[in-house]
Interface confidence: medium
């Protein structure tokens, strides 16, 4: 028999036995020769892979493209189709061989002790029990149990065929748990293997591939694809795979049922496709189809196979990232690579670890970027197989909108004496530096609230019309100095100063700074008073627990009703761009204070004393005086800052040192604290006394030992003490060399 389509100018392989069916007895030798016009191969029953030890395929001695298949001592199990075919074509010749073995008329299953037949309870469906025969003309019946029933061929819907098996309507055996075929030869009964009967449904819920996507491997690695089908109960599943390289040597398919929870209304089936060592030709689409006979569902995934491990940065990898303070910054590490690389981020060479402010992974995320985050970030990718490394530098530039330093430092409501020259300053910090700083002004009375008006903290000044300082008509004569650049607190800042030649009118001044990412402004209330004057006794900046007096002095002939107030805390903070409220127009925010009045020949002096000043005493103090004639109120404001008490600390360390006799030692000990600490020096725990060779300078900060002698060797201690305690540092001075003898000796 011949199969396949005839190819152009290629005849079918020719078999030495010119029959469709050959019947031979058991224990004899089967030998068939196949001749053709190109390379040939044989396929035989029960072993499609060609590794069966009993089967011998040899080249013919008398010709090219000729192969002989020999099986000595055949058995019933050798019954089946023998196919000779051209390699890589469908052209083949087939002969069906019956090995008559009366001891085992049924061909045994290759691997199982029993078989399984799946049936559906459908009146029109037939089922084939595959009890094939090694003898073609047997009398075969089918036994089903339990209860026991026997079915014999009826020449219609029940039949037996040695090449196919026993065919019967499925509903007739759906009650049975198992079936088997039975043959009678010379009054002897022979049974086939048992077949378990499984009644099946057909509905497939879904077919899932795992991994479902993004499968990448390199040549030589193992590919494992799991295909899971979920079905209704009583379903049998047949899996079918489609993949790029179907002739793969190392392919392995394993199908099995998965356990489901008892009482579950569902079954699970798993088919696992394994390719031990993938090649480039295995790259492509893998499709798993699950079929229940009446229904088929499929799913696909793409498998990418790389020639070798590699790592590289993707084209979208940034080199410069710009951000504004406060923003969230995300810098993704865009890479191509297999397997996925290990990713490590560095800032200015220091490894970055993830914490609540920064996440260093595939994406470097800075939650709220600040100025100190500016710098060069290096990302290093390491391929975990080849260990190849690739690095890329990303520069992060953090922009800062203009910030005006004095805003937080100086009271928004200071008063200025009439006729004086005053300098107003705006110190601007911005990245990039501001491209301009402009000054504007307005008369105070044009902006001030009338006493009858309700005060709005968010908008205390109703005025909107700011005038450029070039137009000082009706105001104070002004000169704007050229911007200067200064390094303040380690930052480059732009300082803009406005000089008021003579303080004649009360006004508001505004400086506005603009850069590429924003603007900042500061409003200065320039309240000019001919009225009282405030001075602080004894010190401009007292420390907590010290006493301080605020003196308000006014000309007795002009002013009366001197009163001290403290400016209460604002109900809301003044936000950027808001204006301070004129104090005298709004006494609701003032607290009246107790004070003592003194007089001299011309002035009244109202003294408000703060004993044991505390940090809570900080704030704006207002002295109010009333004009005797006009009854107009005049206010002067002074901001009081109370310095916090700080225990002594010594900055820097004293270093141990070795000096030769006759040389000099100079060391310094810088201490800080409030109140300022006293510095004392000790040698070997005894107070160091100044003499011709030991000099203490700058409040004992600097110690010089001139022309050192052997006896100067020892432990030197610098101790800084105040009422809040002491701090000390120590160093050992070693003096080397022999002492020169003096003339006195």
């Amino acid at each position: 028999a011949s199969v396949g389509l005839p190819s152009v100018s290629l005849d079918l392989p020719r078999l030495s036995i010119q029959k469709d069916i050959l019947t031979i007895k058991a224990n004899t030798t089967l030998q068939i020769t196949c001749r053709g016009q190109r390379d040939l191969d044989w396929l035989w029953p029960n072993n499609q892979s060609g590794s069966e030890q009993r089967v011998e395929v040899t080249e013919c001695s008398d010709g090219l493209f000729c192969k002989t298949l020999t099986i000595p001592k055949v058995i019933g199990n050798d019954t089946g189709a023998y196919k000779c075919f051209y390699r890589e074509t469908d052209l083949a010749s087939v002969i069906y061989v019956y090995v008559q073995d009366y001891r085992s008329p049924f061909i045994a299953s290759v691997s199982d002790q029993h078989g399984v037949v799946y049936i559906t309870e459908n009146k029109n469906k037939t089922v084939v029990i595959p009890c094939l025969g090694s003898i073609s003309n047997l009398n075969v019946s089918l036994c089903a149990r339990y209860p026991e029933k026997r079915f014999v061929p009826d020449g219609n819907r029940i039949s037996w065929d040695s090449k196919k098996g026993f065919t019967i309507p499925s509903y007739m055996i759906s009650y049975a748990g198992m079936v088997f075929c039975e043959a009678k030869i010379n009054d002897e009964s022979y049974q086939s293997i048992m077949y378990i009967v499984v009644v099946v449904g057909y509905r497939i819920y879904d077919v899932v591939l795992s991994p479902s996507h993004g499968i990448e491997l390199s040549v030589g690695e193992k590919l494992v694809l799991n295909c899971t089908a979920r079905t209704e109960l009583n379903v049998g599943i047949d899996f079918n795979w489609e993949y790029p390289s179907s002739k793969h040597q190392h392919k392995k398919l394993v199908n099995r049922d998965l356990k489901t929870q008892s009482g579950s209304e569902m079954k699970k089936f798993l088919s696992t496709l394994t390719i031990d060592g993938v090649t480039r030709s295995d790259q492509g689409l893998y499709t798993c189809a699950a079929s229940s006979g009446l229904m088929t569902k499929k799913n696909s995934t793409f498998v990418r196979v790389h020639e070798k491990p590699f790592v590289a940065f993707g084209s979208g990898m940034e080199s410069l990232v710009e951000a504004t303070v406060g923003e969230r910054v995300r810098i993704p590490a865009k890479y191509l690579g297999y397997p996925p690389p290990e990713i490590k981020w560095y800032k200015n060479g220091i490894p970055l670890e993830s914490n609540h402010t920064i996440k260093a992974g595939h994406v470097l995320t800075i939650m709220e970027v600040s100025e100190r985050d500016t710098g060069n970030y290096t990302v290093i990718l390491t391929n975990p197989i080849s260990k190849e490394k690739q690095s890329h530098v990303v520069s992060l530039v953090v922009y800062v909108p203009p910030q005006i330093g004095e805003k937080s430092l100086i009271s928004p409501v200071d008063s200025y004496q009439y006729g004086t020259t005053q300098t107003l300053t705006c110190t601007v910090y911005a990245i990039p530096p501001p491209h301009h700083i402009h000054w504007y002004w307005q008369l105070e009375e044009e902006c001030a609230n009338e006493p009858s008006q309700a005060v709005s903290v968010t908008n205390p000044y109703p005025c909107e019309e700011w005038r450029s300082v070039e137009d000082f008509q009706g105001g104070n004569k002004i000169e704007v100095n050229k911007n200067q650049f200064a390094l303040i607190e380690g930052k480059n800042k732009t300082v803009s100063t406005l000089v008021i030649q003579a303080a004649n009118v009360s006004a508001l001044y505004k400086c506005e700074a603009v850069n590429k990412v924003g603007r900042g402004e500061r409003v200065i209330s320039f309240h000019v008073t001919r009225g009282p004057e405030i001075t602080l006794q004894p010190d401009m900046q007292p420390t907590e627990q010290e006493s301080v007096s605020l003196w308000c002095t006014a000309d007795r002939s002009t002013f009366e009703n001197l009163t001290w107030y403290k400016l209460g805390p604002q109900p809301l903070p003044i936000h950027v761009g808001e204006l301070p409220t004129p104090v005298c127009k709004n006494l609701d925010t003032l607290w009246k204070l107790n004070a003592t009045m003194f007089s001299n020949s011309t002035n009244d002096i109202l003294i408000m004393e703060l004993k044991n000043a505390s940090l809570q005493d900080q704030g704006d103090y207002v002295c109010l005086a009333q004009d005797r004639k006009t009854k107009k109120r005049h206010c002067v404001v002074r901001q009081l800052t109370v310095l916090e008490r700080v225990a002594p600390t010594i900055t820097g360390n004293l270093e141990n040192q070795t000096t030769s006799i006759g040389e000099s030692i100079e060391v310094s000990c810088t201490a800080s604290g409030n109140p300022p600490p006293q510095i004392m020096w000790f040698k070997d725990n005894e107070t160091l006394v100044e003499d011709s060779g030991i000099v203490l300078k700058d409040g004992n900060r600097n110690l010089t030992i001139r022309r050192v002698r052997k006896e100067d060797e020892g432990l030197y201690t610098c101790q800084a003490c105040s009422v809040l305690g002491c701090a000390k540092v120590e160093a050992f001075f070693i003096i080397e060399g022999a002492q020169e003898k003096t003339n006195l000796e």
Epitope: G220, P309, E342, I380, I385, K387
Partner: antibody, heavy 122, light 107 residues
Amino acid sequence: SLEESGGDLVKPGASLTLTCTASGFSFSSNYYMCWVRQAPGKGPEWIACIYGGSIGDPSYASWAKGRFTISKASSTTVTLQMTSLTAADTATYFCAREEVGVSAPSRGWGLWGPGTLVTVSS
Amino acid sequence: DVVMTQTPFSVSAAVGGTVTINCQASESIYINLAWYQQKPGQPPKLLIYDASNLASGVPSRFKGSGSGTEYTLTISDLECADATTYYCQNYYGSSYDFGGGTEVVVK
């Protein structure tokens, strides 16, 4: 070839620095230099590796982080600094070379030194 | 760190026979696995790298196989000189972990 030195008998709590000197080749991006130790009668235990190229951090076994520091002292020497040593650190310390290729898998640790013995005992 | 479980602890066979040593990784290490032979008083000697590649100078009696998490070293035609300890080692990524070792006894 590779040769380890610096092994000694030290007291618990002490520190010690071991040196591995390469001959016939110098460190480059083709190599990782590694330290391994082997306690008497036990199997080898990886400590740390450092990349021969110019980029990247050393890698450490989780138990070795903090007490052990690997570094390249020159293009032919790699050191292992060990602190707070205990009796459990008694072992022969080996230096080994892992050969790696650009876009090609590593080829294992093909070159080892003979080892240097560190004994921690009071 | 990846845990490498090597079995059996000890295996014996006659001269000319075959022994098989297994090594299991706690997670996939692709094929980044080496096998070493160590004789007393000597450093380990590389036999196999990348699971199945023979290191230079190693006889073809030594055969490595496996990928993912399961690996095997097979020594055939055993000689007396093969009686010693064998270790597997993962070198995937920045983790390098050894198995516990298998002693081969040749009778």
